[in-house]
């Protein structure tokens, strides 16, 4: 299934993009999945469809649910699903985990924090930024286009950062906020030839046909901030984005973790609705930095659904 999670706060604007793509000339219809009722396109409605976008202006808790989008080409229809959850505003300062976008890491050399989902909205600079609910003040903080730059980053700069902006729709203004965590990487350290912790070389992973499967590529690169380090998956020697199989996707953003003081990265490969042909592919976990590249190959094998042992 082509499904995407989206969330927002009540009385704020929320704009969701259809997970299925198409050409500009294709029409897109939106429906409430439960009732199959068409979502209007007239902008006078609080919830309305605008091509590939579904707009909640503003959102209400009752809007939560699954929405279906159908991208109609002249000869074929592509269906996607948007799983939308609208939450009540919290009275206290804490932003719950379910409202957080992906964590970003920064260092003294690179301290950009991008405002999540902002590209979907009609907004004008400047953005307002808050850290742990306090408005950011001082010359160290610079709001630039859709991101925040922090000069001379220190470990104390770690925390939850919220961007706030105004979406304009036909002269009406709606507030939008989005929060993500920012972690600070230690500048002191060293770099090693990548060490892949998982998967093992030539590992065989058992999967069930028709079910979802996850493969994690995890590697460590040294201690402290790494100038260049990446982990990624390849299919038959091809980047995931170039392979063109929408069921197989890398998890957005790399997770940074520190194991025994080591700087490690992991990338999850998600395979939706495993098919027979997926068993024929070669899955390569690649870890690379300035020292070089290490590759571990994984293959999938069919797991008998009634076979419960690990």
């Amino acid at each position: 299934k082509f499904s995407k999670q989206s969330w927002g706060l009540e009385n704020e604007a929320l704009i969701v993009r259809c997970p299925r793509q198409g050409k500009p000339s294709y029409t897109v219809d939106w429906y409430y999945s439960q009732t199959n009722k068409s979502i209007p396109t007239q902008e006078r409605n609080r919830v309305f469809a605008s091509g590939q976008l579904l707009k909640f202006l503003p959102a209400a808790v009752a809007d939560s649910g699954i929405y279906t989008c159908i991208v109609r080409s002249p000869t074929f229809n592509r269906t996607g699903y948007a799983n939308v959850t609208i939450y009540k505003k919290q009275s206290d300062c804490n932003v719950p985990d379910y409202l957080m976008y992906s964590t970003v890491s920064g260092s003294e050399k690179n301290s950009k924090i991008y405002c999540p989902t902002i590209d979907l909205y009609n907004w004008t600079a400047p953005l307002e930024w808050f850290k742990n609910c306090q408005a950011l003040q001082g010359s160290r903080y610079r709001a630039h286009k859709s991101f925040l730059v922090i000069d001379n980053v220190m470990t104390e700069d770690a925390g939850d950062y919220t961007c706030k902006f105004i979406h304009n729709e036909n002269g009406a203004n709606y507030s939008v906020t989005a929060t993500r965590s920012f972690t600070v990487k230690d500048e002191q350290g060293f770099s090693l030839f990548p060490v892949i912790g998982a998967p093992a070389q030539n590992e065989i992973k058992e999967v069930e046909i028709g079910k979802n499967a996850n493969l994690t590529c995890s590697a460590c690169f040294g201690k402290g901030t790494q100038f260049l380090a990446a982990v990624l998956w390849q299919l038959n020697g091809t980047k995931i984005t170039d392979f063109g199989e929408p069921r197989i996707q890398q998890e957005e953003g790399q997770n940074q973790s520190f194991s025994n003081g080591l700087a490690c990265l992991d990338m999850v490969l998600r395979i939706a609705d495993v098919k027979e042909e997926d068993l024929l592919l070669q899955y390569d976990c690649l870890a690379l930095n300035l020292h070089g590249l290490r590759r571990h190959t994984v293959r999938l094998s069919r797991k008998n659904p009634i076979d419960h042992h690990s």
Epitope: G22, K23, S25, T75, F76
Partner: antibody, heavy 120, light 111 residues
């Protein structure tokens, strides 16, 4: 610069399976909206659409030939492969691959074509 | 299937004159207000070349002498003025429904 090139056997025997490869450059079949199709033209006759495949692996076939056709893509190699089973002398034709690009659905770039003769 | 009927089957035109080829579809090729009809030129030993897309849009690099018109089921390709190197077969093609279909072709000869 967009280019497409067809390759495959020039002669096949009746009942055999024909496998044609279209190798392209100048665009990616992972780009939203892109497609690659196959068209054939018997000597002195009109063009006939066979099949095409889209960026998201949606495949469409000519219903008259669907049972005999399979189209696949290898995005990493920039290739699209068409197989046609149970070949017959009436399948003798020049086979073209073409890109479906632009804001609408049509063939905007064509390969030079490859001539396939079916004969025992 | 949508059947495309071209007329005439062949025509001969003097240089500098106008050539008109028509294509009639067995049903409408309209989609969201757009006519999904193309015109291709094919010279001997060469692949087809796109001239006109969605009924009236001239493909980049194609001389302005070529124009397309029509909507629904009736479409026209006009070449004005005709030049000696326009000798070729011309095909209309619809992409409104699968199977995509082509006309039987019109052979243009220059007198």
């Amino acid at each position: 610069q967009v280019t497409l090139k067809e390759s495959g056997p020039t002669l096949v025997k009746p009942t055999q399976t024909l496998t044609l490869t279209c190798t392209f450059s100048g665009f990616s079949l992972s780009t939203s909206g892109m497609g690659v199709g196959w068209i054939r033209q018997p000597p002195g006759k009109a063009l006939e659409w066979l099949a095409h495949i889209w960026w998201d692996d949606v495949k469409q076939y000519n219903p008259a030939l669907k049972s005999r056709l399979t189209i696949t893509k290898d995005t990493s190699k920039s290739q699209v492969v068409l197989t046609m089973t149970n070949m017959d002398p009436v399948d003798t034709a020049t086979y073209y691959c073409a890109r479906i690009g632009g804001d609408y659905d049509y063939f905007d770039f064509w390969g030079q074509g490859t001539t396939v003769t079916v004969s025992s | 299937d949508i059947v495309l009927t071209q007329s005439p089957a062949s025509l001969a035109v003097s240089p500098g004159q106008r050539a008109t080829i028509t294509c009639r579809a067995s049903e409408s090729v309209e989609y969201s207000g757009t006519s999904l009809m193309q015109w291709y030129q094919q010279k001997p030993g060469q692949p087809p070349k796109l001239l006109i897309y969605v009924a009236s849009n001239v493909e980049s690099g194609v001389p302005a002498r070529f124009s397309g018109s029509g909507s629904g089921t009736d479409f026209t390709l006009t070449i004005n003025p005709v030049e000696a190197n326009d000798t070729a077969n011309y095909y209309c093609q619809q992409s409104r429904k699968v199977p995509w279909t082509f006309g039987q072709g019109t052979k243009l000869e220059i007198k």
